[in-house]
């Protein structure tokens, strides 16, 4: 199947991907165009053409050319300058600022907490199944199977540290070799990048914001996939990670370290442990083929227990099972012996919501999954809104310049490496790459950080999470110290190798180009984002898993033709874009194939048919929520609540009302003027920094 042409251009002319758009201009009746598509639904529109806008300012200015969609939006100032304010206005402005900061930190706190609860929810829903993936004996001989198990388990439990710790305990108890563990670690690295991709989906409401956010999130995915694509075969052929880490581990003089510092967890744990607490050992026990663990609940009930060793009389099948002949006796029917038994005395119950409900793990998991996703979504929306109202004027300019500007020549190349260090440092502080990259995603979306800058920050985040793992390894008990350190180092060197591959030379920064390509497609066909997520994190790994279980002949039989077709398509695509004259006329484009094999349009039509019936209920809900939001934020009455509310938009447009919700950074004054609603700014309106 040929690729869709949209993949080709990372930064095409917007007219190519914003259907029906030519240039940015005021909305005027246009007889020439019969239909217009602003979304993935095909609704016939007569007389008027809805054009995508990037700022309400352009609605009342002379026509301008559409900017490159990847350029950051101009964060316009909508308030009175500090110098023009009276004392009351200044005090009010300061309090507004403090209030916003408190709100921002509050929502950020709940955002991080919801990520933690989301991870717990995934573990409750899929943790036991994930544990069973590990108990597959084929992992030893099949690195590809190890890789997909790493991906699937991490996706199911939403935590690479959980899957890594399972691998560590399996290596420590000789159930797994370090060689077999390396592909699993690589897979865990891929799996952990799903979190920020899910977070990016929350910004689906605005095309340009979603384009940036989704590309910013998937740059992490592409880096990990590409690294594995190159480094897994290299590792299988040379075992360089195993050898290098073995040498390092052997040169260490081991002493059990202190516990790895819990930095962000110190703040979030008091809250998250009131929601739910899990017994993580259960997943590890399942992975290690412990039959008793399969019936255990992951939800922790007893938090304070007393373990005591006592000698107990136990029955044994025969004298051969006696601990020693002198410690064996009979009651005339059964044979008894003395055994050292550790018994757990439950002292105090945990203090979380689900402790007394005795619900099955799946039920608790689903409840938490829904709640955490709602909180995550709500917090994200509010963070974006607050940031939007704060990051205006000179504040925005300063922040954007600080983050996105390079060092002066000749040290410009160092900027990216500093960003890598910043990413690593920040991840070390928050103790989770998922949290850091998820927090980065909305900032990319609203245009504070460019993808080019987000890329090294994300790479740094990958390094940061491995340094945390190394510290944790150094603090682990003697029996697991060696194996956990070696695995943590494998993880570290894998990420270092990946950075060396895909960062130093600008030409090799493929993940950026691929992410931008995907961002463009996803902005145009938003369903494709979910499609991508399902294919890359579930379908492909599950297919490889299934084929691997069927054995090498089946895997090779299916895999080789697929890989061959992919390479053929890529070569053809390269020739089409670079030197099409080399190719016969028929192969210079994809038109020789059926439309559904080289364009998403037919698929879009099919999906629109299926999603159509759900759009109106969604729209109503959306509109109610949006109206409430608009009242709180002081938005205009004609707020464009949802892209699926086309009937509303068209009705208003027919009356000559420009339908456009003010973007987070749009000039509210201008958009109000457009609606004949201009109010004199008073001391209560937006405040701007000096």
């Amino acid at each position: 199947m040929a690729p869709w042409p949209e993949l080709g251009d990372a930064q095409p002319n917007p007219s190519k991907y914003l259907e029906g758009a030519t240039s940015q201009q005021p909305i005027t009746p246009d007889k020439s165009k019969e239909t217009n598509k602003t979304d993935n639904t095909e609704v016939p529109v007569t007389k008027f053409e809805l054009l995508p806008t990037y700022s309400t300012a352009t609605l009342i200015e002379e026509p301008t050319e559409v900017d490159d969609p990847w350029n950051l939006p101009t964060l316009q100032d909508s308030g009175i300058k500090w110098s023009e304010r009276d004392a009351k206005g200044k005090i009010l402005c300061v309090f507004q600022g403090i209030g916003r900061l408190i709100l921002l930190l509050g929502f950020l706190y709940f955002f991080v907490c919801s990520l933690d609860v989301l991870s717990s929810a995934f573990q409750l829903v899929g943790g036991k199944m994930a544990g069973q993936f590990f108990s597959n004996s084929s992992i030893m001989s099949n690195p590809l199977l190890g890789l997909v198990i790493g991906v699937l388990v991490t996706v199911f439990v939403q935590s690479s540290s959980t899957s890594t710790s399972i691998v560590v305990s399996m290596v420590a108890s000789s159930l797994l070799t370090v060689r077999a563990a390396i592909p699993i670690i690589m897979g865990a690295n891929i799996g952990t990048s799903i979190t920020n991709t899910i977070v990016a989906l929350m910004q689906v409401g605005d095309r340009s914001e979603f384009r940036r956010a989704f590309a910013g999130a998937t740059v992490h995915d592409f880096f990990n996939w590409l690294s594995v694509l190159v480094l897994l075969p290299v590792e299988v052929a040379t075992h360089y990670l195993e050898v290098v880490t073995q040498l390092i581990v052997e040169s260490f003089h081991f002493k059990n370290g202190e516990d790895a510092p819990d930095l962000l967890k110190v703040i979030t744990k008091p809250f998250t442990k009131l929601i739910v607490q899990l017994d993580k050992k259960v997943i590890s026990q399942i992975a290690m083929n412990d039959e008793t663990a399969k019936n255990k609940s992951l939800v922790k009930i007893w938090c304070k227990t007393f373990t005591n060793m006592t000698q107990m009389n136990v029955t044994v099948p025969s004298m051969a099972n006696c601990t020693s002949p002198s410690l064996c006796w009979t009651d005339g029917i059964q044979i008894w012996t003395m055994k050292n038994v550790t018994y757990k005395e439950n002292i105090a119950k945990c203090q979380h919501i689900f402790v007394n409900f005795h619900l099955p793990d799946l039920a608790v998991g689903i409840i938490l999954l829904i709640i955490s996703l709602l909180v995550l979504c709500g917090c994200l929306i509010m963070i974006v809104k607050i940031l939007g109202s704060v990051l205006k004027g000179q504040v925005a300019t300063v922040i954007k310049k600080t983050i996105n500007t390079d060092f002066p020549f000749p040290f410009a190349w160092l900027t990216g490496y500093l960003a890598i260090l910043v990413g690593a440092g920040m991840t070390f502080i928050v103790q989770s790459s998922s949290v850091f990259t998820s927090a980065l995603t909305p900032l990319i979306g609203i245009g504070v950080i460019t993808i080019e800058r987000a890329y090294p920050l994300t790479l740094g985040s990958n390094i940061g999470t491995t340094t945390t793992a190394i510290l944790a390894a150094l603090a682990s008990p003697g029996n697991t110290l060696r194996s956990s350190l070696q695995i943590a180092l494998c993880h570290f060197f894998f990420n270092i190798s990946g950075i060396l591959l895909w960062y130093p030379i600008p030409f090799t920064r493929l993940p950026i180009r691929m992410a931008k390509g995907l961002g463009n497609i996803s902005a145009k066909y938003r369903w494709f984002a979910i499609f991508y997520l399902i294919i890359f994190f579930f379908l492909i790994p599950l297919t490889v898993f299934g084929l691997s279980l069927a054995g090498w002949p089946v895997l090779v039989g299916v895999g080789v033709p697929v890989v061959f077709i992919i390479i053929l398509v890529l070569c053809l695509r390269l020739l089409q874009s670079r030197c099409p004259r080399v190719l016969p006329k028929k192969l210079q484009n994809w038109n020789f194939l059926p439309l559904c094999m080289h364009s998403l349009k037919p698929w879009d039509a099919v999906i629109s048919k299926f999603t159509g019936p759900f759009q109106m209920p969604c729209c109503c809900c959306c509109r109610v929520c949006c109206r409430v939001c608009c009242l709180l934020c002081g938005c205009p009455k004609c707020c464009r609540c949802s892209k699926c509310c086309q009937d509303l938009e068209e009705g208003q447009e027919a009356q000559g009302v420009p339908v456009k919700a003010p973007e987070t950074f749009d000039n509210i004054t201008i958009s109000r003027e457009a609606q004949g609603e201009v109010r004199a700014p008073d001391s209560k309106t937006e405040c701007t920094a000096l």
């Epitope: 002198s326 410690l327 064996c328 006796w329 009979t330 009651d331 005339g332 044979i335």
Partner: antibody, heavy 120, light 107 residues
């Protein structure tokens, strides 16, 4: 209190069989193992076997397998021992006894014993 | 089967004496040994189990000791009501086996 009641004496002909009872009271019948012990002036005391009334599980001294059969009736809280193909060597006092010290074979309650005489 | 041997069939004693009754097992029985007292015309009565644990209601003048193969029952200060037959039992292996008994008589 715990009581094990056995019939005082049984007179049987050689080759015949006898089924002696041990009626219990004062405790939960199905809880403890019921042991049977044979006592003769010449041979001393010999353990015949034991039954766990709760499940009907039995254990025999190899010497008495085929000779003795142990049963228990939960409804009447009574244990039985049947001795087959009696000979003069089977003449003895037979005790039923229970061990309430659960995991041990030390028997702490004994019946009064049934004196079996095998004579023609 | 494990054979429990009580070397003395009879022991002549006086009231107030310290009496030691011995029992030897043919193989290691750990501490799975019990001691019984049987008076003429009566059923046996448990005195000691687990070699040295006194059964409820047994006077403290009765003590047991030993392990492995050699076991002893000691009556610290013999009373007239203690004149009876004393036998040991092992419950280390099936079948349970008893000693032949030691009868205490007045000199």
């Amino acid at each position: 209190q715990v009581q094990l009641q056995q019939p005082g004496a049984e007179l049987v002909k050689p080759g015949a069989s006898v089924k002696m009872s041990c009626r219990t009271s004062g405790y939960t019948f199905i809880t403890y193992n019921m042991h049977w012990v044979k006592q003769t002036p010449g041979q001393g005391r010999e353990w015949i076997g034991a039954i766990y009334p709760g499940s009907g599980d039995t254990s025999y001294n190899q010497k008495f397998k085929g000779k003795a059969t142990l049963t228990a009736d939960k409804s009447s809280s009574t244990a039985y021992m049947q001795l087959n193909s009696l000979t003069s060597e089977d003449s003895a006092v037979y005790y039923c006894s229970i061990s309430t010290i659960i995991t041990t074979g030390a028997v702490d309650y004994w019946g009064q014993g049934t004196s079996v005489t095998v004579a023609s | 089967d494990i054979v429990m041997t009580q070397s003395h069939k009879f022991m002549s004693t006086s009231v107030g004496d310290r009496v030691s009754i011995t029992c030897k097992a043919s193989q290691d029985v750990g501490t799975a040994v019990a001691w019984y007292q049987q008076k003429a015309g009566q059923s046996p009565k448990l005195l000691i189990y687990w070699t040295s644990t006194r059964h409820t209601g047994v006077p403290d003048r009765f003590t047991g000791s030993g392990s492995g193969t050699d076991f002893t029952l000691i009556i610290r200060s013999l009373q007239s009501e203690d004149l009876a037959d004393y036998f040991c039992q092992q419950y280390s292996r099936i079948p349970l086996t008893f000693g032949s008994g030691t009868k205490l008589e007045i000199k």
